[in-house]
């Protein structure tokens, strides 16, 4: 399951890179699979929010990103994820790359990477 999620993630990152015009030399943070969930590419200064993954969900490869990005002028709409919700994890895209997730998965979602690998 997790190998499949990882493969789907890489596909989604590829599509997002094309949509956003990202390449290897672009400033910002590359999309990544962190062994728990999928993070879309982001520009420096953006905060990306993801919902806690359902551990054994089967991904639809054609699904849209389940993340919302908050930039300077994009605060999302009423359907957006909100850091004030429970079960939401954020990472900031900084000049040094991705920040650590906040909250950490174990505290936000009740599980951590060791479980995802079993």
């Amino acid at each position: 399951i997790f190998k499949k999620e990882q493969a789907m993630c890489l596909e989604k990152i590829q599509r997002a890179n094309e949509l956003m015009g990202f390449n290897d030399s672009s400033p910002g943070c590359p999309g990544m699979w962190d062994n728990i969930t999928c993070w879309k590419p982001a520009h420096v200064g953006e905060m990306v929010l993801v919902s806690c993954p359902e551990l054994f969900r089967i991904f639809n490869p054609d699904q849209v990103w389940e993340t919302e990005t908050i930039g300077e002028s994009d605060f999302g709409d009423s359907n957006s994820l909100d850091l004030s919700d429970m079960g939401v994890v954020s990472r900031n895209c900084t000049e040094d790359g991705w920040s650590e997730p906040f909250p950490h998965y174990f505290d936000a979602c009740g599980f951590d990477e060791y479980e995802s690998e079993t």
Epitope: S84, M86, G87, H104, D107, G110, Y114
Partner: antibody, heavy 123, light 107 residues
């Protein structure tokens, strides 16, 4: 019914090691759904979370930075218990020490506690 | 570390009163908050988790509310067994931290 029974000395000399044990009944220290925590309480510091251990295919510990260099929490699967060791104690470590089970339902919370052990650090 | 504060530090009330205790976090914690009751010489007892969810076996006169940085524990129709000290605790990031407590005594 989950019960946590604490044991260990109530008096420890400065610079020595504080050792307490928490025996679990009604659950298992190897449960994939729980965490096993130590908390202490003193008039000066109030309630202070010290750390936890848990099993999710392998053992993992999280410790409070304030005690990270001195603390060890170890599970004992054969006896379904877990222990606290706090090295190089000083009188500031005098407190009531509690073990507690952490459970998850939207957030981690401490739903069962041991009876508490007053540990005095004094020569 | 996230700092938790509570107000008031103590309050006097009578049986049947409705009381509210406030807890404030030094940064937003969504609803990753629990409330505990402690009586002298005893361990804390879980009342509320996830900001507002009542722990099994806890009377419905206890309720929690709030999100972000400000939270409230309400006890409707205070009972004799409710005179105790109440603590909030954040669970969004370690080290988990507790409020200093609110002591509820008999007026």
């Amino acid at each position: 019914q989950v019960q946590l029974q604490q044991s260990g000395p109530g008096l420890v000399k400065p610079s020595q090691t504080l050792s307490l044990t928490c025996a679990i009944s009604g659950d298992s220290v190897s449960s994939r759904y729980a965490t096993w925590n130590w908390i202490r309480q003193s008039p000066s510091r109030g309630l202070e979370w010290l750390g936890r251990t848990y099993y999710r295919g392998q053992w993992k510990n999280h410790y409070a930075v304030s005690v990270k260099s001195r603390i060890t929490i170890n599970p004992d699967t054969s006896k379904s218990q877990f222990s606290l060791q706090l090295n190089s104690v000083t009188p500031e470590d005098t407190a009531v020490y509690y073990c507690a089970r952490g459970m998850w339902n939207q957030n981690w919370f401490l739903d069962h506690w041991g009876q508490g052990t007053l540990v005095t650090v004094s020569s | 570390d996230i700092q938790m504060t509570q107000s008031p530090s103590s309050l006097s009330a009578s049986v049947g009163d409705r009381i509210t205790i406030t807890c404030r976090a030094s940064q937003p914690i969504s609803r990753y908050l629990s409330w505990y009751q402690q009586k002298p010489g005893k361990a804390p007892k879980l009342l509320i988790f996830a900001g507002q969810r009542l722990q099994s076996g806890i009377p419905s006169r206890f309720s929690g509310s709030g999100s972000g940085t400000d939270f409230t524990l309400t006890i409707n129709s205070l009972q004799p067994e409710d005179f105790a000290t109440y603590f909030c605790q954040q669970a969004i990031s370690i080290p988990y931290t507790f409020g200093p407590g609110t002591k509820v005594d008999i007026k």
